[in-house]
Every structure is written in structure tokens, then in C-alpha cells.
């Protein structure tokens, strides 16, 4: 299983941009217009246009509410007036440069309309959305607009019992056959068009792929077995002349396999799919997100597939056929017989045209009848390397987007951004046959499921957008700037981040226009490439005899083990003298003069069979008797951001050029106030930094009082 994320960013720790409108929910349809830098958001009863670079900036809004009459009729059918009998936007697709095609559940009477992007008003077409959009907001759906025609997968009736994959077209509308071998209680996940290259030698057609999970027809168990499927139709399909009239003649489906070769663990419920297109990729790669059917332990997996493998299955694979055993029991077996020519389900290519099959309308009946009877392939689509890219325990992933990026050394990484049902986003890469989860970001404070993920691919403007029930969040692809040291930057093993020695900052490569010369990045995590730290920094503290000291160690890595050294000896945190707070900060009880000295917080992290040791913090502690006037016994204390309680903080300057600025000041009433401007602090948020290689114990002291002191 994949390790835990190396770093966890809490919602408050990182800069996230949010969009939500009062009383508007279910922000589940997202559409990005890269050229306009606009993100379109389809929610319940509303569509918004926001600035894609800063989604908190709303540009336009339009509401599409359900009339009271419609609501009442819907409620009469036993549906909830407050939730179900509303208009959930389910289709948000580009129709032209100036309009969007929008469909909503419309109180169980699905409707579609055109949204004019100039006026941001609906044209009032009120088209019947049956077959394009579900009746029930709880039912699955997917759609893709291809050359002005909407291809959708959804349910065709009020009950949601009739599944359909259709093309909404004025000249050639097509749909699936309503038959169990074609679609058996599918849960639609994703659809996309795969264009054939114009110089394709076989004059091939564009294909539209559909991804769904359905009830298996080929496997028999006591319970209903779910199977993930990839299906495809040809864009040029016009249906059959007699057989399969106004039905797909090119609909074929195959099983998607995502399992570990060495275990019986099968991931058979498809959650989401992302098609990765990249200039370096001849054939697109699609990433699919799965969970097992019986998922009581919270398992999720990601498998990657070459589209060429899927196409090979459809073009040359064997078919499955059904046979009725006994009265109503159907068994599925491999069809070994001669397959009609032209091949059933094949797109019309130059070879077919040469044989005078210029359109699906003049395909021979035997070919059409065969594909009608055999929509299911016997061959399965297997993942790249025959194994999942990622398997994670104790998490339910919901959505995936993938970005292909190049590290400084030229290595190409597919960065997986995977959202969870608790509002988090994981960023993961494959590193030498292992998975590295770079970070976890809490996108939504309320831990609500992420319903939609979208990736912007515009150079220099790289964001992930996440939609949930309560709103949309915009996050950058990386939080490089949060890595305060070269070691942190390198150990992050984030292909987007590199250390810039001149500025002593961790920078995002996709934001740097300048050449990458001089930047430090080591995807192996070898921090020895970092420039030598000629100066060591330490924090100097003064504590009262008999009190308790808390020494901070802000190590963000969840993969690191923190330990403390005192006068070069490792401290045992379990002893009565010491304790660990939050697995990192050191507590020293019952302070005495013998506790004075240098304390070092070190982290130990396994990186690629190597153990990396890092000095995270150095503290110089001196235990003395505190003069009485410093603190009144009734001192009321407040907690500073660094969880340290202080009455006076002085920042020691080695140059001594300017007087120290107090970070926390004691007022006459004994309350503590923060200054208007924060004092520069180290990565561990400690207010006192002394920069020197040798501790100077006689420099100005900073006095700290813990609440357990002087009582």
C-alpha cells in the first residue's frame, strides 16, 4: 500500500481561493475556458462564471429555478420538495464560442437550454433533457460535447431503471439497445472523445469512450458482482438500416482490470477517469480511480491504461456470447466462431470504404446482428505494468486529475491529484516502482466529499479546482514556497519544486520563466546536493528552576521520526524527565541547572533505502532563578501562534545594528498583546534566532514562561 502523505497541509495553513454563494449547493459541474480564463460552475439552480485565476471573483451568474407548480407535481410523485424537486445542473458543455449547453434535472423533468455567454442568459429553448440528463439528482450521469453533438450516459426514465448511452443529434440521433447485455444497471462515470490524427493511415473515425461500472453478466456469485467497463462508439456511426435502426452499430464494451497480480484484491468499482493527453504521448493514457465492491477498510486504487490497448481489444479481441442455461439463467462464454466481415462494432475506415461500406447504414445485416448480440468483449483492458499505480488504505478517493510534468533532470512524471471523500487532495507520483504521496491538502474545512476535480493546463497558470456540495476551491499545483529550507524542498520530492540558492527559496518550476540553471532539485531526495549551511541557527531560552520547558520542533514531514539530542546524547522521551508533545515538541519537566545546554531536534526519514538525518532545530537552554518582578502571580496568559507563552521576547542581532523588537509585550494589566507586524521567525515559528556556528551563551537572553512555571 502507498505510504501516508509526506506532508499534510491544513486548510488554514495554505492559500486556497474559495467560491460559494449563500443558499446555493451542489457545485458539481465545472467547465474551464482556458482562453477566456473563466471557470463555469454549474450548481443547484444556478450557473456561475468566475475568474479562473481567482475564483472568488464572480463575473456572471444566472439562476434556473423550478416553478412551484413543477415542484408540487414532483412532490406528488413521492419526491422531496426541499431537495430532489429542484434543478440540479448536470450537463455543462461548450456549444460554441459564445454559448454553453446546459441541462438540469428540473424536478424530475430533465430539461436543456442554451446559455448565451455574452448576456449570460438562457435562450429559453427548454428542450426535453430525457436521455441527456438524469431525472434524479442522485443518479449517475456523464456527457461530452463532440462537434456540437452531445453524447451522454444516463438514465432514460423517472425510475432510473432504463440506462442509455445516446447521441443528441438533429440529423442522426442514436442510442443503445435497451437490453441487459448492452447495459446492466450502469453507474456512469466519465465520457470523452479521442480524436484520430488527421494523417491516420487507415482513415479512421473519432471515437467516444464511456466509462461506467455495471452489474456483471459474465460472473456468477451469490451477490451481484460489479464490473468496471470501458465502452466506445464511433463518431461517424449512423445506425443500421433495418437491424439497429437509430441504435449504435459501433457500441462495444470491455472489462477494465485493476488488481494486484500477487493478491486476490480486485478493484471493481470505477469512481473516476482522467484522460491524459500530452505532446510527448503518441496515444493518450487514461487514469482510472477504483474502490473494491466490499470496501469496509477504505481502499482505493489508481490504474493507468494505454488507450491503444483498449483499441486493440475492440479491434482484434474476442467477443463474449450469451447462452441460456435452463429457463432464465444466462451464461456468458467466449465466442470462438468466425466473426462476420466487416468486423462488428468497427468504425468505418478506409478498408471498409474500399469494400463499399461507406456508412454504417449499408453494413450487412449479419454484422449488425452480431454486434447487437455481442456488445461485450471477452478480452479485458489491462493496466500499464499490469498493476495499479497506487493503492491506498484508509481512504476513499473520489476524483482524479493527472498532470504530466518534467523534472529538472528531464525525467517525466505523471502527477496524480486525487481527492477524498473527506475534502482532502492527495498529490502522488510514481518514483522507481514505488508511490510517493508528496502532500495532502485539506481543501474543504468541513471534510465534505470532493465531487469534481478539474485541472488547468495553461502554462504558468496551473491550478486544481475542486467542487463540493458547499462550494469550489482553487489550489495551486504545488506549495513550494512553504518549504523553508533547501533540505525541505528537496525532501519533498515534488517535481514542481526546486530550490533557488540566490533567493534561498523553494520555487515552483511552472512559474519560473527564467532558465532552470542553478536551481536545485533531486527527485531521489538526496539532500546532500543542498548548499552547505555555513551558519547554524539556534534558539536561546532562559527558564526557571523547577519549571517545565517546551522546546519546539516544527518538522512537517509525516514520514520523519523526530528525536532529541542533549549534549550529543539521545533523549528517551518516555522517561519521567522528558515527554513529547504532538510527537515532535520536547517537554522537559522539573528543570534544574543540569538541564542547561544545547538541545537538538533531529529528524530521521527513510528516502529510497537511505536514512536522511536532518537537524531541524537547535535550542540553547539555561536554567536560572527568575527575578521576582518579572511576573505577577496573577499573570493571565495567551497562546502565541507558535504555541509558546511568553512575556518578553528579544531578537538577538549578531550585527547589533538595531534595537530588538518585542514580539509579545506584557501590558500593565498582565494581558499579552501582539505587535502590529510579526517578527521574522524561523521555520519552527520560534521567535528568537541566534545565527552563529558556536552558541554564545552570553548574548541577550529571551525569557519564556510556561503556564506550568512559577505556580
Amino acid at each position: 500500500f502507498a505510504p501516508i502523505p509526506r506532508i499534510t497541509w491544513e486548510h488554514r495553513e495554505v492559500r486556497l481561493v474559495q467560491f460559494h454563494e449563500p443558499d446555493i449547493y451542489n457545485y458539481s459541474a465545472l467547465l474551464l475556458s482556458e482562453d477566456k480564463d473563466t471557470l463555469y460552475i454549474g450548481a443547484r439552480e444556478a450557473v456561475f462564471a468566475v475568474n479562473a485565476l481567482n475564483i472568488s471573483e464572480k463575473q456572471h451568474e444566472v439562476y434556473w429555478k423550478v416553478s412551484e407548480d413543477k415542484k408540487a407535481k414532483c412532490a406528488e410523485k413521492g419526491k422531496s420538495k426541499q431537495t430532489e424537486c429542484l434543478n440540479y445542473i448536470r450537463v455543462l458543455q461548450p456549444l460554441s464560442a459564445t454559448s454553453l449547453y446546459v441541462c438540469g434535472t428540473n424536478a424530475f423533468q430533465p430539461a436543456c437550454d442554451h446559455l448565451n455567454l455574452t448576456s449570460f442568459k438562457f435562450l429559453g429553448k427548454n428542450e426535453d433533457g430525457k436521455g441527456r440528463c438524469p431525472f434524479d439528482p442522485a443518479h449517475s450521469y456523464t456527457s461530452v460535447m463532440v462537434d456540437g453533438e452531445l453524447y451522454s450516459g444516463t438514465s432514460y426514465n423517472f425510475l432510473g431503471s432504463e440506462p442509455i448511452i445516446s447521441r443528441n443529434s438533429s440529423h442522426s440521433p442514436l442510442r443503445t439497445e435497451y437490453a441487459i447485455p448492452w447495459l446492466n444497471e450502469p453507474s456512469f462515470v466519465f465520457a470523452d472523445v479521442i480524436r484520430k490524427s488527421p494523417d491516420s493511415p487507415d482513415g479512421e473515425d473519432d471515437r467516444v469512450y464511456f466509462f461506467f461500472t455495471e452489474v456483471s453478466v459474465e460472473y456468477e456469485f451469490v451477490f451481484r458482482v460489479l464490473i468496471p467497463r470501458i465502452a466506445r462508439v464511433c463518431k461517424g456511426d449512423q445506425g443500421g438500416l433495418r437491424t439497429l435502426q437509430k441504435k449504435w452499430t459501433s457500441f462495444l464494451k470491455a472489462r477494465l482490470i485493476c488488481s494486484r497480480p500477487d493478491s486476490s484484491l480486485v478493484f471493481n468499482v470505477l469512481r473516476d477517469v482522467f484522460v491524459l493527453r500530452s505532446p510527448g504521448l503518441k496515444v493518450p493514457v487514461f487514469y482510472a480511480l477504483f474502490t473494491p465492491q466490499l470496501n469496509n477498510v477504505g481502499l482505493s486504487a489508481v490504474c493507468a491504461y494505454n488507450l491503444s490497448i483498449a483499441e486493440e481489444v475492440f479491434s482484434h479481441g474476442k467477443y463474449m456470447q450469451s447462452a441460456t442455461v435452463e429457463q432464465s439463467h444466462t451464461k456468458w462464454v467466449r465466442y470462438n466462431g468466425p466473426v462476420p466481415k466487416p468486423r462488428p462494432g468497427a468504425c468505418i475506415d478506409s478498408e471498409a470504404r474500399a469494400a463499399n461500406y461507406t456508412s454504417s447504414l449499408n453494413l450487412p445485416d449479419k454484422t449488425l446482428q452480431f454486434v447487437k448480440d455481442h456488445p461485450l468483449m471477452d478480452d479485458s483492458v489491462t493496466p500499464i505494468d499490469n498493476r495499479p499505480r497506487l493503492i491506498k488504505k484508509d481512504v476513499n478517493y473520489t476524483q482524479i486529475v493527472v498532470d504530466r510534468t518534467q523534472a529538472l533532470d528531464g525525467t517525466v512524471y505523471d502527477v496524480m491529484f486525487v481527492s477524498t471523500d473527506r475534502g482532502a487532495l492527495h498529490k502522488a507520483i510514481s518514483l522507481e516502482h514505488a508511490v510517493h504521496i508528496i502532500e495532502e491538502t485539506q481543501l474543504f474545512q468541513d471534510f465534505e466529499p470532493v465531487q469534481t476535480l478539474l485541472l488547468s493546463s495553461k502554462k504558468g497558470r496551473r491550478f486544481v479546482y475542486a467542487g463540493s456540495n458547499s462550494g469550489v476551491v482553487q489550489a495551486p499545483l504545488a506549495f513550494c514556497g512553504k518549504h523553508g529550507t533547501c533540505e525541505d524542498c528537496v525532501l519533498a520530492r515534488d517535481p514542481y519544486c526546486a530550490w533557488s540558492p540566490p533567493t534561498a527559496t523553494c520555487v515552483a518550476l511552472y512559474q519560473t520563466e527564467s532558465p532552470s540553471r542553478g536551481l536545485v532539485q533531486e527527485m531521489s531526495g538526496d539532500a546532500s546536493v543542498c548548499p552547505d549551511k555555513s551558519k547554524g541557527s539556534y534558539r536561546q531560552h532562559f527558564f526557571k528552576h523547577g519549571g517545565t520547558a517546551e522546546l519546539k520542533c516544527s518538522q512537517k514531514s509525516n514520514l520523519a521520526r523526530v528525536f532529541w539530542k542533549f549534549q550529543n546524547g539521545v533523549l528517551k522521551a518516555e522517561s519521567p524527565k522528558y515527554g513529547l508533545m504532538g510527537r515532535k515538541n520536547l517537554l522537559i519537566f522539573n528543570l534544574s541547572e543540569g538541564d542547561s545546554g544545547v538541545y537538538q531536534c533531529l529528524s530521521e526519514e527513510r528516502v529510497k533505502n537511505k536514512t536522511v538525518f536532518q537537524v531541524v532545530a537547535k535550542h540553547v537552554l539555561e536554567v536560572k532563578v527568575v527575578p521576582k518582578p518579572v511576573v505577577a502571580p496573577t499573570l493571565s496568559v495567551v497562546q502565541t501562534e507558535g504555541s509558546r507563552i511568553a512575556t518578553k521576547v528579544l531578537v538577538a542581532s549578531t550585527q547589533g545594528s538595531s534595537p530588538p523588537t518585542p514580539a509579545v509585550q506584557a501590558t500593565s494589566s498582565g494581558a499579552i498583546t501582539l505587535p502590529p507586524k510579526p517578527v521574522p521567525t524561523s521555520t519552527s515559528c520560534e521567535p528568537k534566532i541566534v545565527i552563529n556556528t558556536v552558541p554564545q551563551l552570553h548574548s541577550e537572553k529571551t525569557m519564556y514562561l510556561k503556564s506550568s512555571d512559577n505556580r
Epitope: 447462452a323 442455461v325 466462431g337 468466425p338 466481415k341
Partner: antibody, heavy 117, light 106 residues
């Protein structure tokens, strides 16, 4: 007009081999499948196997696996059936036929093979 | 292999009479195919995929069935229908034929 023209009758000795031909006209054999079917005197029909001349893929009925060899030559639009180690049990009329999901649609006139000393 | 059993093996019918020939499969098949053969001739395709009449077959013929039970029916027997009829499946290897039903005219 679609036609399958089969080679003439054969009288062969036991233990010998024979190669029957089936030449197609009116269509290209690459666009179809050629099957061979055996019919012993006054008996029923037995399927021997088929070939896809487009790619040379062949399937045999298990009881003809050692007996029959099906080949095709697309340049002459001809399919062949070779029978080896002949015995009196192999005395029969052998038909070539085209067939796929519509069944065996076109049949040759048949070739009588007599195995006798 | 799937064994097909035809019944009856031999039957005779008067002109105008309705005739039904049955074909039973030991295990289920998707479709049944029927062929007509007259003495000294090659078999002719008669019914394909259970119920579709081959080109040139008179409309008095029909085919039906599913699973393991199939039949060929002549609504009104005519003299030219006297022949041997074979059923055949295309389901799994080997593609077997029934033993044949010899239909004679009374």
C-alpha cells in the same frame, strides 16, 4: 455470381494422402471464411474446420485435428483440404462452404473421396 | 461438444399438411441454423439465426425456438419440400449438425 468450384473425385489407397481444392469466384475469399464439411454415404454432416484466408487463422474440430490440414491461397482465391493417413472411414463427400453469423451460405458441389485398395 | 438431436428421423406428410421438425440441443445455444438437402445435391442454407429465411426460401417455412429447443415449421406441405433437413449450431466448437430429418411426401 458467387460460386465455389471443387476439384474432381479422388480414388486413393489406404494410408495415402489427398489434397482437395475449392476455388471461389464472384467474391474474394479474404472477405469470408471457408469451412469444410464431411458427409459419409447415406449419413449426416460433420464439420471439419474453417480458415480465415485474410490472416490464415484456422480452427479444427478436435476429431479432425490429426486428419485434416486446411490452407488457402489468396492469390488464386482457392482453399484446400488435405487429408492424411486415409482409411475406409474417410470415404465421403467433402464440401467447402462459406460461413459466418448467417450460417453456411454458399456450398461447393462436393468432392467424393473413395479410399479403397 | 453440443449434441443436436433431431426428431423425427423420418416422416411423411400430405400436401397442405403442417409439418414441424424439432431439434434439441444438449446445452443451450444462441441460434439454430437449418439446411435442406436433396439427394445428389449439396446442402442449401434454409433458415439462419433461428428464424430468418435464407434467400429464395418460400414463406411457408418458419423457424423458432431458444436455448435448447428449436423447430422448423412448414405451414402447408408441398411436394418440393420433400428433402432431408439438418439443424446446426454455431455456438462453440465443434459446430455440430443434427442427424437429419428425412421428410417425404405422402
Amino acid at each position: 455470381e458467387v460460386q465455389l468450384q471443387q476439384s474432381g473425385a479422388e480414388l486413393v489407397r489406404p494410408g495415402a494422402s489427398v489434397k482437395l481444392s475449392c476455388t471461389a469466384s464472384g467474391f474474394n475469399i479474404k472477405d469470408d471464411y471457408i469451412h469444410w464439411v464431411k458427409q459419409r454415404p447415406e449419413q449426416g454432416l460433420e464439420w471439419i474446420g474453417w480458415i480465415d484466408p485474410a490472416n490464415g487463422h484456422i480452427e479444427y474440430a478436435s476429431n479432425f485435428q490429426a486428419k485434416a490440414t486446411i490452407t488457402a491461397d489468396t492469390s488464386s482465391n482457392t482453399a484446400y483440404l488435405q487429408l492424411s493417413s486415409l482409411t475406409s472411414e474417410d470415404t465421403a463427400v467433402y464440401y467447402c462452404t462459406t460461413g459466418d453469423y448467417d450460417g453456411f451460405t454458399y456450398w461447393g458441389q462436393g468432392t467424393l473421396v473413395t479410399v479403397s485398395t | 461438444q453440443i449434441v443436436l438431436t433431431q426428431s423425427p428421423a423420418i416422416m411423411s406428410a400430405s400436401p397442405g399438411e403442417k409439418v414441424t421438425i424439432s431439434c434439441s440441443a444438449r446445452s443451450s445455444v444462441s441460434y439454430m441454423y437449418w439446411y435442406q438437402q436433396k439427394p445428389g445435391s449439396s446442402p442449401k442454407p434454409w433458415i439462419y439465426r433461428t428464424s430468418n429465411l435464407a434467400s429464395g426460401v418460400p414463406a411457408r417455412f418458419s423457424g423458432s425456438g431458444s436455448g435448447t429447443s428449436y423447430s422448423l415449421t412448414i405451414s402447408s406441405m408441398e411436394a418440393e419440400d420433400a428433402a432431408t433437413y439438418y439443424c446446426q449450431h454455431y455456438h462453440t466448437y465443434p459446430y455440430t449438425f443434427g442427424g437429419g430429418t428425412k421428410l417425404e411426401i405422402k
